[in-house]
């Protein structure tokens, strides 16, 4: 059996550190045999069989110059084996960054912090700490560790399925190459690293008579559970065209009339959305939607309420149904789209200049 | 030798915007995690962002998170900072610096003065 | 995030003298410790790594021990060059933190 230990690597490879003095081993002997030793293709001897050495060639402070390959020989001349030397650093430790679009699961991403220049593999697990007293930590086999399964498509991250939102995982990601192991361990609690995505399917829409609004509707991210047991709320931002700021409103639901636009301009308007407990972060932006408010006059016919005071609305629909003004007015419309629910009772708006 | 070269400091306004550049030399830029650590006037100093040698992932400290963006270009062997909304507690001398074999910080350039006040 | 405290505030030595700077960290740091030296003017200069590591071409009057929570920094014998202000700093976790500093100067 060959002398030489197999380090994780392709066959027929070793490995040493820059810098540092490096050993080669000749596979194909036994330990202690002397043989010679060359570099592929030179004829000139680097080391001899009376060196001392046995099958091992020593190269003293390593660099580029002395990667390649190399042949040993037996006193008879028989090939002994070939070895081809690569430097590189042993690993240190990686970057590790955990993230969560729901409260049901988990994904890490990791990175090297040095790139090592040798073959490298990570060997990810976690497991579910549970704390008994104050500075005391049980573990049992009920909190692992487990494996963290890595993409399999090949990308840096691994997925934690089934997490428990209110428990606190430790994450061990450790990155191994012929010269060593290097473990980073990240302590995760999912309430922190909720980021839920941004909210989908964003409309915006005119309402028909009225110049100063827009509808916009919006629904939860395909990510969130279909059947939540936490809610998300929302932060919607709208602005005209050209105009560099954004008003900010918190909507109630999956939807919101903004009662402020100005007429007759193209609004951008954008969504996003953050457990309703305020765990975690604000997801990013939904991409912008745009609409114009109506320019028309009202078309809705009189709510059925109205009827018996008509004579007191008429003069109201007759004001409303005046024509939109010449040029966009900064005024906030001040009519409720809904005589029974007037919307700007129902919200705070904050306006960022 | 390693040699990392800041540049990109001044005077800016409260609210106002800077771009802090780090050249460096000396070895593989591309293999290496950096970042900026800051010392304002008569205090400590202060980690404020590293990046990953991909740049696939970065990090802030809370104080400059959201207004601050780390980022590398490999191929200039360049690392950024981005200031933006910045404040007079930003005011500070930002040294750029290389992590070696995970140690932070271990080469750092000469710093680079950032002065925010009206 | 860890805290680092650093203790003394300052000190004034004298040319020969034996400093001792401790330092503690808020939580089990393992031995994720540097020390550091920073000069007005100067870029900061990293003289021990991993608690205990000297960093090459430091003098050996330097040394540095501790592991978990406390540690501390030695100067055999206080040289002219090695007044200034000392740091340690943390990098266990990802946010690296430093201490408040230890400013040594001559007595």
């Known amino acids: 059996s060959s002398p030489c230990p197999q380090a994780w690597g392709p066959p027929g490879v070793q490995y040493g550190q820059p810098g540092r003095s490096v050993k080669l081993c000749c596979p194909g002997v036994t330990a202690g045999d002397p043989v010679s030793w060359f570099r592929d293709g030179e004829p000139k001897l680097l080391q001899g069989p009376d060196s001392g050495l046995g099958h091992e060639l020593v190269l003293a402070q390593a660099d580029s110059t002395d990667e390649g390959t190399y042949i040993c020989q037996t006193l008879d001349g028989a090939l002994g084996g070939t070895v081809t030397l690569q430097l590189g650093y042993p690993p240190a430790r990686p970057v590790v960054s955990c993230q969560a679009a729901d409260y049901e699961n988990f994904s890490c991403t990791w990175s090297p912090s040095q790139i090592s220049g040798l073959p490298t593999r990570y060997l990810t697990s976690y497991r579910k700490k549970t704390v008994l007293g104050a500075d005391s930590q049980r573990r049992s086999p009920s909190t692992g560790p487990w494996p963290c399964p890595q993409d399999p498509l090949g990308a840096a991250r691994c997925v934690v399925h089934g997490a428990e939102f209110w428990s606190q995982y430790r994450i061990n990601v450790t990155e191994v190459n012929p010269l060593g192991a290097s473990t980073r361990l990240l302590d995760v609690s999912l309430q922190s690293i909720l980021r839920p995505d941004p909210p989908q399917g964003l409309r915006v829409e005119s309402v028909p008579g009225y110049p100063r609004r827009l509808r916009a509707s919006w629904t939860y991210p395909a990510s969130w559970p279909s059947q939540p047991h936490f809610l998300l709320k929302f932060r919607l931002q709208y602005r005209p065209a050209q105009h560099p700021a954004w008003s900010t409103v918190e909507p109630a639901g999956l939807e919101e009339v903004i009662t402020d636009a100005v007429a007759g301009l193209p609004h951008a308007v954008r969504v996003s959305a953050r457990d309703f407990l305020d765990a975690g972060t604000w997801s990013t932006w939904s991409p912008e939607a745009w609409g114009t408010p109506s320019t028309g006059p009202l078309q809705d016919e009189i709510p059925d309420w109205s009827q018996g005071h008509g004579q007191q609305l008429e003069a109201v629909v007759a004001q409303e149904d005046s024509p939109a003004p010449a040029r966009p007015s900064l005024q906030p419309d001040p009519r409720p789209l809904d005589h029974r629910d007037p919307l700007e009772q129902h919200h705070h708006h904050h306006h960022h200049h | 030798e390693v040699q990392l070269l800041e540049s990109g400091g001044g005077l800016v306004q409260p609210g106002g915007s800077l771009r802090l550049s780090c050249a460096a030399s000396g070895f593989t830029f591309s293999r290496y995690m950096m970042g900026w650590v800051r010392q304002a006037p008569g205090k400590g100093l202060e980690w404020v962002s590293s990046?990953?040698?991909?740049?696939?992932?970065?990090i802030y400290a809370d104080s400059v998170k959201g207004r601050f963006t780390i980022s590398r270009d490999n191929s200039k062997n360049t690392l950024y900072l981005q200031m933006n909304s910045l404040r007079a507690e930003d005011t500070a001398v930002y040294y750029c610096?290389?992590?070696?074999?995970?140690?932070?910080?271990?080469?750092w350039g000469q710093g680079t003065l950032v002065t925010v006040s009206s | 995030d860890i805290q680092m405290t650093q203790s003394p505030s300052s000190l004034s030595a004298s040319v020969g003298d034996r400093v001792t700077i401790t330092c503690q960290a808020s939580?089990?740091?393992?031995?994720?410790l540097n020390w550091y030296l920073h000069k007005p003017g100067k870029a900061p200069k990293l003289l021990i790594y991993d608690a205990s590591n000297l960093q090459t071409g430091v003098p050996s009057r330097f040394s540095g021990s501790g592991s978990g929570t406390d540690f501390t920094f030695t100067i055999t014998s206080l040289q002219p060059e090695d007044f200034g202000t000392y740091y340690c700093q943390q990098y266990d976790t990802l946010h690296p933190s430093f201490g408040p500093g230890t400013t040594v100067d001559i007595k």
């Open positions: 610096a290389r992590d070696h074999m995970g140690i932070v910080a271990t080469d």
């Open positions: 990046i990953v040698p991909s740049g696939g992932i970065t």
């Open positions: 939580q089990d740091i393992t031995n994720y």
